[in-house]
């Protein structure tokens, strides 16, 4: 978790002098409670936006927006703490809006935004806006939270971001798999424009089950430049196991930008359709 560029993070707006500060996620008011505290944020909204760094890289960011309730507690509002918690790593990053002037009611509702938290593809975050000072131990909570899911690199708008492109999102292998005679699979896919090796991972399953009955790994050496964007054809031999008929083919590239952590593509071959009508049973069974 990080902030996008540390260039001028602004929270000031007409009628309010405000500065954005790094935060330890443990505001002083948590340790030294105040008697009078503001109400909670209203209408917390989170959207996925995209922002360029000064180097020209494009990153997904969480655009956080909220408004203030129209009550007298804004007289005691000293700022806000924005917290983003990445759920799978438990990593948290916070910033603090510090109001340098008192808020006053004016003809339209106060609205705040912040768009500098960089988020990762296919990750879930808990986004919280806490009004400051925080409430006394038994006081009503004055924060709002939402669990925000960032699309993965298959998403059209995510595909062109720097983190997705680094993991190989622009490569479309267009995998085709066909079943041949004599327990063989023919796998065909388009190579990318990089001299790097690939791995084909074959996993086979029984018709309606999810535990594998056969696994095989096939190494494809790095193509020569004249082979870039060409189709690579590989024939895989299957184990002759009756009912081991559903095959998942996964292609793992090893691009220089993502090494062994590149996006994998897969295709599945289903089991052949079973005939609807069972074999007829004779009316009588001969004894000889």
């Amino acid at each position: 978790l990080r902030l996008l560029d540390h260039r001028a993070l602004v929270c000031s707006q007409p009628g309010l002098n405000c500065t954005v500060k790094n935060s330890t996620c443990l505001d002083d008011s948590w340790i030294h409670p105040r008697n009078l505290t503001p109400s909670s944020p209203k209408d917390l909204q989170i959207q996925l936006h995209f922002a360029h760094t000064q180097q020209g890289d494009l990153f997904p960011v969480a655009h956080i927006e909220w408004t203030l309730q129209t009550d007298a507690s804004i007289l005691y509002l000293e700022g806000a703490e924005l917290s983003v918690l990445q759920l799978n790593t438990n990593e948290r990053l916070c910033v603090r809006f510090e109001f340098l002037s008192k808020l006053r009611h004016h003809h339209r509702r106060w609205r705040f935004t912040f768009s500098h938290f960089v988020v990762d593809p296919d990750q879930e975050y808990e986004v919280t806006v806490h009004h400051l000072p925080k409430p006394i131990p038994d006081g009503d909570p004055n924060h709002q939270s939402k669990n925000f899911l960032v699309p993965d690199c298959e998403h059209a708008r995510m595909k062109v971001t720097t983190p997705c492109m680094s993991s190989g999102s622009l490569w479309d292998p267009n995998i085709t798999v066909e079943t041949l005679e004599a327990h063989q699979l023919r796998v065909s896919f388009t190579l990318w424009n990089e001299s790097t090796h690939y791995q084909i991972l074959l996993t086979s399953f029984p018709h309606m089950e999810n535990h594998s009955c056969f696994e095989h790994m096939h190494h494809i050496p790095a193509p020569r430049p004249e082979e870039f964007h060409q189709r690579s054809n590989v024939t895989l031999t299957l184990r002759n196991l009756k009912g081991c008929c559903r095959h998942q083919v996964q292609i793992q590239p090893f691009f220089s930008s993502c090494l062994n952590d590149c996006l994998r593509h897969s295709a599945t071959v289903s089991c052949p359709e079973m005939p609807d009508t069972p074999e007829p049973i004779p009316d009588y069974m001969p004894l000889w």
Partner: nanobody
């Protein structure tokens, strides 16, 4: 021009099933989370269910959990709501709504809905 057109609403008996559809056009359907929202007679709007851009994540209001199933077909630009074990309290106008921003939030919407359909009427009565 963005359009959302719901269909499938009708009069059904309690305990029966119904499938609502929403045909979307005028925007990149496969980039946005979509939702079903309903408004019963004399009631306010109630969020029913939401689904992420690719259908991998779904959420439901407690009142419909276990009975309703939301799904989508991005190839057909369509959103669906399968409603089983219908009750009288499910009677409402059902709207399909597009999330304004990208991303998906658990248990509801991340941002406002910027486009709505005209609604399809579901009446559950014996």
């Amino acid at each position: 021009e963005v359009q959302l057109v719901e269909s499938g609403g009708e009069l059904v008996e309690p305990g029966r099933s119904l499938r609502l559809s929403c045909a979307a056009s005028g925007f990149n359907f496969d980039e946005y989370a979509m939702h079903w929202v309903r408004q019963g007679p004399g009631k306010g709007q109630e969020w029913v269910s939401g689904i992420s851009w690719n259908g991998d994540n779904v959420d439901y209001a407690d009142s419909v959990k276990g009975r309703f199933t939301i799904s989508r077909d991005n190839a057909k630009n369509s959103l669906y709501l399968q409603m089983n074990s219908l009750r009288a309290e499910d009677t409402a106008l059902y709207y399909c709504a597009k999330e304004e921003g990208l991303g998906y939030c658990r248990g509801g919407s991340c941002s406002t809905f910027d486009y709505w359909g005209q609604g399809t009427l579901v009446t559950v009565s014996s």
